[in-house]
Interface confidence: medium
């Protein structure tokens, strides 16, 4: 549609997992010269923030400071750009970005089977467990933007556990896991102690990437 600008990009610095009481910068940017940026948080504690765009080297951007992090600041964020004042017309929304607060509950334990040091090509499974009745476990690898997510299994020997099969080992890395409850998907536990997985053989940098969240495509956007 004529006059409707393509979606801007939304990034979290240093990342989308934010410890309780810490601050995250959500940067909305585009190569379209937007005068205004809006950052919208969906859900129970919805809110809309506004910043004037900064322009440099053909890029427009706005840095939204979110924090100190609390439960009501976690959620799904999208940003929009606006070029003109008359009529107020928003760009299509950015892809959604889920901001998660961590450090709320006791940390789970993370272990590797058959062990943290494996031969290249050998299958390895990471297990996350806790005595807390977490519904979900989330596994992150240092340097990766996305986490793998698995439902916790039934209680066994007093713990709730999820197994993350990494398949034939081709890469090492530092892993952490978090627990969360079904009713509060943006509120995670403290991180497990980091687990260094070492692969003896040829390391590569592939990591099973979970499917991207579906982005909301934009109708023409407008403000009243």
């Amino acid at each position: 549609h004529e006059g409707v600008h393509r979606k801007p990009s939304l990034l979290a610095h240093p990342g989308r997992l934010v410890k309780s009481e810490e601050t995250v910068i959500l940067q909305c940017w585009s190569d379209v010269r937007f005068e205004h940026f809006l950052l919208h948080r969906e859900g129970k504690f919805k809110d809309t923030l506004h910043l004037i765009g900064e322009h440099h080297d053909g890029v427009s951007k706005a840095n939204f400071s979110i924090g100190p992090m609390m439960q009501d600041l976690a959620g799904t964020y999208r940003c929009y750009g606006s070029v003109t004042h008359s009529p107020y017309q928003l760009s299509a929304p950015s892809d959604p970005l889920d901001i998660v607060i961590t450090g709320l509950y006791e940390k789970p334990s993370l272990s590797a089977q058959p062990g943290p040091t494996v031969l290249a090509g050998e299958s390895v499974t990471l297990s996350c467990s806790s005595r807390s009745s977490y519904d979900m476990y989330h596994l992150s690898r240092e340097g990766e933007a996305h986490e793998c997510r698995f439902s916790a299994g039934p209680k066994v020997n007093g713990t709730f556990q999820a197994d993350f099969p990494l398949g034939p080992a081709t890469h090492g890395g530092t892993y952490r896991c978090f627990g969360s409850f079904r009713d509060s998907p943006y509120e995670w536990s403290n991180s497990s102690d980091p687990l260094l997985v070492s692969v003896t053989g040829n390391p590569s940098n592939s990591w099973p990437s979970p499917t991207e969240p579906s982005s909301k495509t934009g109708n023409p956007r407008h403000l009243h």
């Epitope: 549609h1 606006s82 107020y88 109708n219 023409p220 403000l223 009243h224």
Partner: antibody
Framework: QVQLVQSGAGVKKPGSSVKVSCKAS????????ISWVRQAPGQGLEWMGG????????NYAQNFQGRVTITADESRNTAYMELSSLRSEDTAMYYC?????????????WGQGTLVTVSS | QSVLTQPPSVSGAPGQRVTISCTGS?????????VHWYQQLPGTAPKLLIY???NRPSGVPDRFSGSKSGTSASLAITGLQAEDEADYYC????????????FGGGTKVTVLA
């Protein structure tokens, strides 16, 4: 629950101005759009213009350009609509309405309306 | 004259189904803009009935439904009740106007005795 409470009815002389207020009680409207919509007796709804307090700017329907001014005082949670050079055909019920900036961008909350009568 | 065209009136007996059309053009509904519907009971302010073409706010009975196709939209009321007698307005946006928000002319729904 947010409510929009408008100022009371008034009778105005042709050629004069009227200023109607719209106060958000039970919440803020700074991150919403506030529009003004009028309805002449027995007629339909007509959008006059709107303001987005966080943008600090207003825009107006072509029919009202130059005659209407929409402002907001964030500290008072109040929006204002001033219509000048009044004529008899401006006799109408004037409503303020709140719209989300993003989905759903419909007018989800309306004021109770302010009846403005223009008569000599 | 309104940018969006609605029939001036429709009527039906209690329990019947009535539909109200809202016809626009390629610069408003046909451009992909959402359509919203409002109900205005006699002597009261308009109330949001359907938003985003087909979504009902909480508290609106599921007898009311909305749809959109091409350059037009429609509102359907099934199981018509006496309290549904009111004026109904569609609303969208128009990229060719600086008067950006546009309404239909309104449709009076009469519930026959």
């Amino acid at each position: 629950q947010v409510q929009l409470v408008q100022s009371g009815a008034g009778v105005k002389k042709p050629g004069s101005s009227v200023k109607v207020s719209c106060k958000a009680s039970g919440g803020t409207f700074s991150s919403y759009a506030i529009s003004w919509v009028r309805q002449a007796p027995g007629q339909g709804l007509e959008w006059m213009g709107g303001i987005i307090p966080i943008f600090g700017t207003s825009n107006y329907a072509q029919n009202f350009q130059g005659r209407v001014t929409i402002t907001a005082d964030e500290s008072r949670n109040t929006a204002y609509m001033e219509l000048s050079s009044l004529r008899s055909e401006d006799t109408a019920m004037y409503y303020c309405a709140r719209g989300e900036l993003v989905d759903p961008d419909a007018f989800d909350i309306w004021g109770q309306g302010t009846l403005v009568t223009v008569s000599s | 004259q309104s940018v969006l065209t609605q029939p001036p009136s429709v009527s039906g007996a209690p329990g019947q189904r009535v539909t109200i059309s809202c016809t626009g053009s390629s610069s408003n509904i046909g451009a992909g803009y959402d359509v919203h519907w409002y109900q205005q009971l006699p002597g009261t302010a308009p109330k949001l009935l359907i938003y985003g073409n087909s979504n009902r706010p909480s508290g609106v009975p599921d007898r009311f439904s909305g749809s959109k196709s091409g350059t037009s939209a429609s509102l359907a009321i099934t199981g018509l009740q006496a309290e549904d007698e009111a004026d109904y307005y569609c609303q969208s946006y128009d990229s060719s106007l600086s008067g950006y928000v546009v309404f239909g002319g309104g449709t009076k729904v009469t519930v026959l005795a």
